[in-house]
């Protein structure tokens, strides 16, 4: 790919006009970034700093406990998914700074922007797995005592990752670099060209499997868990449940704009004014979705402070307290049904 003359371009950004004056020279330039892009850059910067440090800390805290603590396995996998996505941020940041120019080649175009979708599917599948675990702890404690183990947890995580990779393939396959003639720019994006139906299908599958279906099932799941918890007057466990609900709710809140704009764009003509407006907001929607990659460590710290009253402990020990405390089911073989029902909620965050 040739390098471009960015320093002194004779041509810049143009206001489209319907008329064509063939004798009008076109030496007009504009190098300012749009407001949505500036906001996206700010969010990317914050997410990268908090996400890399926060998730690295979570990985460090949970990795040592993952052999014996099931909660640690869940949090380790979630943190790895978030951490991986954060690694793409410097590249995405650079691209936006260069007015969406993509100088990183075709392979990077296929892989790096797909990481956020891999994160979305991995996160929601892991959240679903964790929610199923919590549900079983509350409603099937005897089964949990007999079968709930680290091996099964790792298998569940492996299945979640496998499905996530599978669901990310369409985005990966349709990502291409397109070198625009003017303004001279290489763009990284999806190109379905002749197949608008396939584009819509991918967007619908993403909306249903990555958002609507999990939203429905997790809402039902946590409604049952909350009702059971409250009916047992488990005040301690409701605090932890707030962490769980916060993580799940944040997922849906931060993915909502991306999903809505994505489905709308798939049904609109690329030259329509609404499509162009949504396209201008695309980076902002992606950056908003990326907040998911740094929000969990923040939730854990806030929760940890809540449980400790004050932040007296060091950050790693605080996180360890929130993330690796195992449910009563695995700690004691002698228990009553009501004990499990109320106490199993303890630090089963997410």
């Amino acid at each position: 790919m040739d390098s471009f003359n960015y320093t002194t371009p004779d041509y810049g950004h143009y206001d489209d006009k319907d008329t064509l004056d063939l004798n009008t020279p076109v030496d007009k330039t504009s190098n300012t970034l749009r407001v949505p892009d500036i906001l996206a850059l700010v969010i990317f910067a914050v997410v990268f700093l908090v996400g890399v440090l926060g998730n690295a800390l979570v990985v460090w805290v949970t990795a040592f406990e993952a052999k014996r603590t099931i909660n640690a396995i869940w949090f380790l996998n979630l943190a790895v998914a978030d951490f991986l996505s954060c690694l793409a941020l410097p590249i995405l940041f650079t691209s936006i700074v260069q007015h969406h120019h993509w100088p990183f080649g075709g392979a990077a175009c296929s892989i790096l922007p797909s990481l956020i979708l891999l994160n979305m599917y991995a996160s929601i599948l892991l959240l679903a797995t964790i929610s199923a675990d919590r549900f079983l702890l509350v409603f099937k404690p005897i089964w949990c005592q007999n079968f709930r183990g680290a091996g099964l947890a790792w298998i569940a995580c492996a299945v979640a990752w496998g499905l996530a990779l599978l669901l990310t393939i369409p985005s990966f396959l349709y990502r291409v670099v397109r070198e625009e003639y003017f303004p001279p720019k290489v763009l990284c994006g999806v190109d379905y060209s002749h197949d608008k139906r396939r584009e819509r299908a991918v967007a619908i599958v993403r909306l249903v499997l990555g958002f609507l279906w999990p939203l429905l099932t997790l809402t039902i799941c946590y409604t049952f868990i909350l009702l059971r918890t409250w009916s047992r007057r488990a005040t301690r466990s409701t605090k932890t449940l707030k962490v769980v609900v916060a993580v799940v709710a944040s997922f849906f809140i931060f993915w909502l704009p991306y999903q809505v704009t994505g489905i709308m764009m798939s049904f609109l003509e690329p030259s329509s004014p609404t499509f162009l407006l949504l396209k201008k907001l695309d980076s902002l929607c992606v950056s908003f979705a990326y907040i998911n990659c740094c929000i969990n460590p923040i939730i854990y710290v806030v929760a940890g402070q809540g449980f400790q009253g004050r932040l007296r402990k060091s950050l790693p020990s605080l996180l360890r307290n929130v993330l690796t405390e195992e449910s009563v089911v695995r700690e004691s073989k002698s228990f009553t049904r009501s004990t499990v029902d109320t106490m199993a909620q303890k630090t089963q965050a997410v």
Epitope: N5, T8, D10, Y11, Y14, D15, D16, K17, T19, L20, D21, L22, N23, T24, P25, V26, D27, H100, R178, E179, E180, Y181, F182, P183, P184, K185, L187, D191, Y192, S193, P270, S271, P273, F275, L276, K279
Partner: antibody, heavy 121, light 112 residues
Framework: QVQLQQSGAELAKPGASVKLSCKAS????????MHWVKQRPGQGLEWIGY????????KYNQKFKDKATLTTNKSSSTAYMQLSSLTYEDYAVYYC??????????????WGQGTTLTVSS | DVVMTQTPLSLPVSLGGQASISCRSS???????????LHWYLQKPGQSPKFLIY???NRISGVPDRFSGSGSGTDFTLKISRVEAEDLGVYFC?????????FGAGTKLELR
């Protein structure tokens, strides 16, 4: 009015080099990019590349990257294309064309009359 | 590279009749600014190509209204409603959205 006057027909041997010229008049030369297009006998058009006369920045079709070299002379408002290591495949009519448009240089609005390059031993 | 496929390669017409030329691109020609840079040129025998239509459907001044362009994304059409003798020649579609700029193979409009 705008005119692009190209040099006359060229006859060259395989392996040799030729330099085709395109003299512009009737407009400000440095304000418009100049493109070059190849047309083999009875065939379609192939884009070779363009040059920005203001900065002398040239952009090439990868296919012609080692074949063509685009230059300009601002004082004489002339664009040049040098073709090197000629083969029989280079036998064609070569056009220079000016681009314009209100939102960018997207359209070939004026074309030269074409220069026929014959490669023969 | 974007491949521009023109059909038919030869189109016999009667004077006063209608002609329709199709042009299909291998990739979407919608630019990131929302415009579609698909243009049409006419080349008469022994002459340089002449600019007719820009951005799918916009005629340049001096081009009669019997010429009309349409289409979007990857499929485009040039229609000539009442063919006159001066319309005969080779019609090329061209895209200037992506590098390298590419042209169709051409459609020869000739008398039946």
């Amino acid at each position: 009015q705008v005119q692009l006057q190209q040099s006359g027909a060229e006859l060259a041997k395989p392996g040799a080099s030729v330099k085709l010229s395109c003299k512009a008049s009737g407009y400000t030369f440095i304000s418009y990019w100049m493109h070059w297009v190849k047309q083999r006998p009875g065939q379609g058009l192939e884009w070779i590349g363009y040059i920005n006369p203001r900065s002398d920045y040239a952009k090439y079709n990868q296919k012609f990257k080692d074949k063509a070299t685009l230059t300009t002379n601002k004082s004489s408002s002339t664009a040049y294309m040098q073709l090197s290591s000629l083969t029989y495949e280079d036998y064609a009519v070569y056009y220079c064309a000016r681009v314009t448009g209100t939102e960018g240089p997207y359209y070939f609005d004026y074309w030269g009359q074409g220069t026929t390059l014959t490669v023969s031993s | 590279d974007v491949v521009m496929t023109q059909t038919p390669l030869s189109l016999p017409v009667s004077l006063g009749g209608q002609a329709s030329i199709s042009c299909r691109s291998s990739q979407s020609l919608v630019h990131s600014n929302g415009n579609t840079y698909l243009h049409w040129y006419l080349q008469k025998p022994g002459q340089s190509p002449k600019f007719l239509i820009y951005k799918v459907s916009n005629r340049i001044s001096g081009v009669p209204d019997r010429f009309s362009g349409s289409g979007s994304g990857t499929d485009f059409t040039l229609k000539i409603s009442r063919v006159e003798a001066e319309d005969l020649g080779v019609y090329f579609c061209s895209q200037s959205t992506l590098v390298p700029l590419t042209f169709g193979a051409g459609t020869k409009l000739e008398l039946r």
